[in-house]
Interface confidence: low
């Protein structure tokens, strides 16, 4: 026990005088955040000036605070020991890391161009005041049909088909990443989807006639609660389609 | 009408530095960003950073990450691009460009180009 | 880094040729895409932004087209004055990265 006692002491005496000899070598070591190292003045630790800070210690200048001036507003003012923080004036919004340019909004419906802001084209939306419109999600292609029309603001809300209309399945699912528009034919899709969910029922029904014999009303109860739904994305694809598609006749573009 | 005015050729040897400048005149040089983009002999464009003169933030192409410094001086409306440890493949003409959507953009406005040759 | 390949690397063509050069990109840049023509000795000059935005001064014989990973620049009638390097470039994410440029020569 005196031991490990000793050992501390000792250790702490060897870094007390280590910090020591380091302040006297380095005399500007001691100047904490807020102040610069001024040589001019014999390494005395100065105040920095109005408009300027240090984040650490031990520096021989201080930084000159960032101006949030024209687009940008402050958002934290700067101290003598750290930097001031801007953000947007209303009607843009921040880019790059620590909000380095202010970028225009726009209205939900639009995208920003070179231009300035430009309504979604027929077919893709955008729902944030930022961004770039993407394509409506194509429901056909999840074996779903569509719900809810999309609109420039807007996705379309993708509704069940006869496959979804099993025991606790979801009638409305979110919309999955979008793609490419298909072109499957409705009646076969709504044909396939019948026989398969023929087929489910046969299947179903086999598997509960030997559940009930085999594992008992518990089993059965079991099975019923849980939902026929596989697990569905939602999350969008991140770029999507801008007003350049030849093939749009749509109006509100610039083609 | 907007202008990029950029300094004269360079001979340097290797593990040298070099720094190559940029006038701009004719706009509001602090509202847009200023690009390099270099380009060896015989081959195509390379985008090596740029910078945001409003306040001096700089970006970098993973490529010359340590080894290129991109300045501002607002002041006299002036951007830098200083390429340090310089070897025979950095051997080519340096644009400065300017884009003024954002800071990911065309480049509408370019810089004469400044040859540097880097040889022993 | 997302890669721009153009095609085809070299052209050869006539005045009064409708000329069309392709570029594709490795993943979907939306419609952030610029064409630029450049001559020997001079400086990159911007045509295209946009995808199919024709920068001002640019003579309407210069169309772009396309959206997603495949993109088309298409001189309708190509005049003397258009025989020089073409590239492509996106700005849809960091870095912004060129095509490795297409030669439009006389035939």
């Known amino acids: 026990m005196g031991n490990s006692c000793y050992n501390i002491v000792a250790t702490l005496l060897l870094v007390l005088n280590f910090e020591r000899t380091r302040s006297l070598q380095d005399p500007c070591s001691n100047c904490p955040a807020g102040t610069f190292c001024d040589n001019n003045r014999n390494q005395i630790c100065s105040p920095c000036p109005p408009n300027s800070f240090s984040s650490a210690g031990g520096q021989r200048t201080c930084d000159i605070c960032r101006q949030c001036k024209g687009v940008f507003r402050t958002r934290k003012e700067c101290s003598s020991t750290s930097n001031a923080e801007c953000d947007c004036t209303p009607g843009f919004h921040c880019l790059g890391a620590g909000c380095s340019m202010c970028e225009q909004d726009c209205k939900q419906g639009q995208e920003l161009t070179k231009k300035g802001c430009k309504d979604c084209c027929f077919g893709t939306f955008n729902d944030q005041k930022r961004g770039i419109c993407r394509p409506w999600t194509n429901c056909s292609l999840d074996g779903k049909s569509v719900l809810v029309n999309g609109t420039k603001e807007r996705d379309v809300v993708c509704g069940p088909s006869p496959a979804d209309l099993s025991p606790g399945a979801s009638s409305v699912t979110p919309p999955a990443p979008a793609r490419e528009p298909g072109h499957s034919p409705q009646i076969i899709s709504f044909f396939l989807a019948l026989t398969s969910t023929a087929l489910l029922f046969l299947l179903f029904f086999l598997t509960l006639r030997f559940s009930v014999v085999k594992r008992g009303r518990k089993k059965l109860l079991y099975i019923f609660k849980q939902p026929f739904m596989r697990p569905v994305q939602t999350t969008q694809e991140e770029d999507g389609c801008s007003c350049r598609f030849p093939e749009e006749e749509e109006g509100g573009c610039e083609l | 009408q907007v202008q990029l005015v950029q300094s004269g050729a360079e001979v340097k040897k290797p593990g040298s530095s070099v720094k190559v400048s940029c006038k701009a005149s004719g706009g509001t040089f602090s509202s847009y960003a200023i690009s390099w983009v270099r380009q060896a002999p015989g081959q195509g464009l390379e985008w090596m950073g740029g910078?945001?003169?409003?306040?001096?933030?700089?970006n970098y192409a993973q490529k010359f990450q340590g080894r290129v410094t991109i300045t501002a001086d607002k002041s006299t409306s002036t951007a830098y691009m200083e390429l340090s440890s310089l070897r025979s493949e950095d051997t080519a003409v340096y644009y400065c460009?300017?884009?003024?959507?954002?800071?990911?953009?065309?480049?509408?406005?370019w810089g004469q180009g400044t040859t540097v040759t880097v040889s022993s | 880094d997302i890669q721009m390949t153009q095609s085809p690397s070299t052209l050869s063509a006539s005045v009064g040729d409708r000329v069309t050069i392709t570029c594709r990109a490795s993943q979907s840049i939306s419609s952030w895409l610029a064409w630029y023509q450049q001559k020997p000795g001079k400086a990159p000059k911007l045509l295209i932004y946009?995808?199919?935005s024709l920068e001002s001064g640019v003579p309407s014989r210069f169309s772009g087209s396309g959206s997603g990973t495949e993109f088309t620049l298409t001189i309708s009638s190509l005049q003397p004055d258009d025989f020089a390097t073409y590239y492509c470039?996106?700005?849809?994410?960091?870095?912004?990265?060129f095509g490795q440029g297409t030669k439009v020569e006389i035939k």
């Open positions: 910078i945001i003169p409003i306040f001096g933030t700089a």
């Open positions: 470039q996106q700005y849809h994410s960091y870095p912004q990265t």
């Open positions: 946009d995808a199919s």
């Open positions: 460009a300017r884009s003024e959507f954002r800071f990911y953009a065309d480049f509408d406005y």
